[in-house]
C-alpha cells in the first residue's frame, strides 16, 4: 500500500515538470515516489497512453535496513530529439496492490524558430519557361509567414504578403537563386538556397534539307537560351531497328549513337559516313554555357539508295562455236541499295556493242550471230540498283572452249534486249 494511512493517498512526492523548446532538444522528465515495501515499476504516460518503449531509467533507494521499510523511487524519461509527436501531457503511473496511481502532469511543448517541412530544390529550367518552387514551414508558434527571395532580393514587401507555399515563376532568362524565409514569433529561419539553372529551350522543327546515300543534311530552329548564347548543337543519329521501338520521347536507344557537333549558327549540319538505303532516327540538342537543352524527339529519316560502288567480280567468258558462256559473282564493293540485276555488254572488233539486262542471274549463255568468226569479242558486266548502274567491269575477252572444260547447259539468249542505258566505253 502507498505510504500514509489512507489507501487513496498518492505515493508521488515529485511530479514531472514542463519542458518547452525547439526541435531537436534533449530533455529529461522526472518523477519521484515514496513507497513501503517492494518498489513498483514506474510507467510513463503521454496524453494518457502508456509509452511502451520509453527511454526511462529507474533508481530505488531504501530508506531503512528492512525490505519492508520505505523506498524512494526515481524514474527519469529521456526525450532525445524533441519532435512535434513528442509534445503533450506526461505523467508517471504505478500499480500498488490493487490500486493505480498517476502523478500530476508535466507538459512538453515545442516552441522555437520555424522548421522547414519542404525547401526549394535545385533544378534546371528551359529559358522563358514557367515553373513552380515549393516551401513549407511550421512552428509552433504559429502562424509561420513565408517570404520568398530571388537572388537575395525579397519578392514581397513583408512576410506573408507575397506567395506562400508555392512560388510561380513565369520564366527566367538567366540562372538565378531562390530561397524562402520563414517568420514566426520566435524569429526567422532561412531555407537552403536553390539554384535554378537556365538552359536553352529544346530546338524545334528538326527536318531534312537534302539526302544522299551516305549523308544527310539536316536543319533545325534553335530555342531561346536567355542571356547565354548557344555555343554549339549536338546531333545524334542511330540506326533504326524494328525491335528497338524508338518513338517520340521514348528512352535512349540501346546502341551507341553517332554523335556530331555543329557550330552555330547556322543551325544546319551535314551528317556523313552513313549507310545507304538505311533507316535512321536523329535528334538534336543545343548547349549554352549553362548546359544542354533537352533533346528533340527522335525523327525517323532514311538515306536513299545509291548505285553499286564496284563492278561484279571474277567474270569468266568462254566461247564454243556460236555460243559464249559468261558467269560472274556479286560485287565485293557495297551495293548501296537493293541489287535489282546485272547488265551485260559484248562487242566484237568491228561489230556494234550489244547490251542486255540479265536480271539477278549470275551466268548467261549467249547465242552469237553468224558463224562465230567474229574476232576479239569482249564482255563487260555491271550491277544495278534502283538508283542506277554501278561501274562496268573491265572488258573480258572471250576464250576459246577447250575439250574437257565443263560446259553447263543454259538458256540461250537469242535476241538481246533493247539498249536502255549508256554504252560502256572502251
Amino acid at each position: 500500500a502507498p505510504r500514509g494511512t489512507q489507501a487513496e493517498e498518492s505515493p508521488f512526492v515529485g511530479n514531472p515538470g514542463n519542458i518547452t523548446g525547439a526541435r531537436g532538444l534533449t530533455g529529461t522528465l522526472r518523477c519521484q515516489l515514496q513507497v513501503q515495501g517492494e518498489p513498483p515499476e514506474v510507467h510513463w504516460l503521454r496524453d494518457g497512453q502508456i509509452l511502451e518503449l520509453a527511454d526511462s531509467t529507474q533508481t530505488q533507494v531504501p530508506l531503512g535496513e528492512d525490505e519492508q521499510d520505505d523506498w524512494i523511487v526515481v524514474s527519469q524519461l529521456r526525450i532525445t530529439s524533441l519532435q512535434l509527436s513528442d509534445t503533450g501531457q506526461y505523467q508517471c503511473l504505478v500499480f500498488l496492490g490493487h490500486q493505480t496511481f498517476v502523478s500530476q502532469p508535466g507538459y512538453v511543448g515545442l516552441e522555437g524558430l520555424p522548421y522547414f517541412l519542404e525547401e526549394p530544390e535545385d533544378r534546371t529550367v528551359a529559358a522563358n519557361t514557367p515553373f513552380n518552387l515549393s516551401c513549407q514551414a511550421q512552428g509552433p508558434p504559429e502562424p509561420v509567414d513565408l517570404l520568398w527571395l530571388q537572388d537575395a532580393v525579397p519578392l514581397a514587401t513583408a512576410p506573408g504578403h507575397g506567395p506562400q507555399r508555392s512560388l510561380h515563376v513565369p520564366g527566367l532568362n538567366k540562372t538565378s537563386s531562390f530561397s524562402c524565409e520563414a517568420h514566426n514569433a520566435k524569429g526567422v529561419t532561412t531555407s537552403r538556397t536553390a539554384t535554378i539553372t537556365v538552359l536553352p529551350q529544346q530546338p524545334r522543327n528538326l527536318h531534312l534539307v537534302s539526302r544522299q546515300p551516305t549523308e544527310l543534311e539536316v536543319a533545325w530552329t534553335p530555342g531561346l537560351s536567355g542571356i547565354y548564347p548557344l555555343t554549339h548543337c549536338t546531333l545524334q543519329a542511330v540506326l533504326s531497328d524494328d525491335g528497338m521501338g524508338i518513338q517520340a520521347g521514348e528512352p535512349d536507344p540501346p546502341e551507341e549513337p553517332l554523335t556530331s557537333q555543329a557550330s552555330v549558327p547556322p543551325h544546319q549540319l551535314r551528317l556523313g559516313s552513313l549507310h545507304p538505303h538505311t533507316p535512321y532516327h536523329i535528334r538534336v540538342a543545343c548547349t549554352s554555357s549553362q548546359g544542354p537543352s533537352s533533346w528533340t524527339h527522335w525523327l525517323p529519316v532514311e538515306t536513299p539508295e545509291g548505285v553499286p560502288l564496284g563492278p561484279p567480280e571474277n567474270i569468266s567468258a568462254t566461247r564454243n562455236g556460236s555460243q559464249a558462256f559468261v558467269h560472274w559473282q556479286e560485287p565485293r564493293a557495297p551495293l548501296q541499295g537493293t541489287l535489282l540485276g546485272y547488265r551485260l555488254a559484248y562487242q566484237g572488233q568491228d561489230t556494234p556493242e550489244v547490251l542486255m539486262d540479265i536480271g539477278l542471274r549470275q551466268e548467261v549463255t549467249l547465242e552469237l550471230q553468224g558463224d562465230g568468226s567474229v574476232s576479239n569479242l569482249t564482255v563487260c558486266v555491271a550491277a544495278y540498283t534502283a538508283a542506277g548502274d554501278g561501274p562496268w567491269s573491265l572488258p573480258v575477252p572471250l576464250e576459246a572452249w577447250r575439250p574437257g572444260q565443263a560446259q553447263p547447259v543454259h538458256q540461250l539468249v537469242k535476241e538481246p534486249s533493247t539498249p536502255a542505258f549508256s554504252w560502256p566505253w572502251w
Partner: antibody
Framework: EVQLVESGGGLVQPGGSLRLSCAAS????????IHWVRQAPGKGLEWVGW????????YYADSVKGRFTISADTSKNTAYLQMNSLRAEDTAVYYC??????????????????WGQGTLVTVSS | DIQMTQSPSSLSASVGDRVTITCRAS??????VAWYQQKPGKAPKLLIY???FLYSGVPSRFSGSGSGTDFTLTISSLQPEDFATYYC?????????FGQGTKVEIK
Amino acid sequence: EVQLVESGGGLVQPGGSLRLSCAASGFSLSGSWIHWVRQAPGKGLEWVGWINPYRGYAYYADSVKGRFTISADTSKNTAYLQMNSLRAEDTAVYYCAREYSGWGGSSVGYAMDYWGQGTLVTVSS
Amino acid sequence: DIQMTQSPSSLSASVGDRVTITCRASQDVSTAVAWYQQKPGKAPKLLIYSASFLYSGVPSRFSGSGSGTDFTLTISSLQPEDFATYYCQQSYTTPPTFGQGTKVEIK
C-alpha cells in the same frame, strides 16, 4: 562512494576489435544514463555514445555508428564498449561517465558528474 | 551538430587574478551548457551545469552565466590548483559537443 573504473584498453591493429568495461560502484547503473567520451592524445573531448542500462537503449556519435556497440549488464553494474573495425583515428583515452541527475521535475540537456580514470586504446600496426 | 567555440584557447594568469573564459554556440542551446576542468593525465571534473548552477563540492569562486548562444565561466580569484584546461559542453541537442578547450597557465 560513487566510482567508475574502466578497463580493457591496449594496443590493437587497424581493423581489430577491443572491448572496454566500465565497472560502477556506489550507485545503481539502472538509474542513469552512462556515457562514453574519448580524448585523442593532446586533443579535446569527443562524445562517443550513451546507454540507458535500465532499458538497453543506446545512442551513438556518427563517427562510430555501425562499428561500436554500447551495452550494460545491470546485474554486474557494468557498462561495456565493444569496438570493431578500429582505425588509427580511434586512438584515444576512453572514459565512461555517469550522467548527472538533478532532482527537479524536468531539465533540458545534461552533464556528466562522475568520470572513470580512463583507459588508453592505441590502434597501430 | 552544434559547434562550441571557446576563447581564448589559452591564457596566462597569476594567482588571485579574475579569469573569464567564453564559449559560443553555433545555435541557441538555451541553458544546456556545462563546464569541466581537466588536469593532465586526469579525467574531467564537472564544475557548472545548466549554464549557471554550481555542482556540489565545487568552490564558489567558480561561476557560470549565459543563455542562448553566449556563455561564460568565471574564476573570481585564481588559485594554484586552478591551473588546468577548461571545456564547455552543450547538451541541448544530441550529439553533445565540447568546446576545443582553454588552457589556463601560470604567468
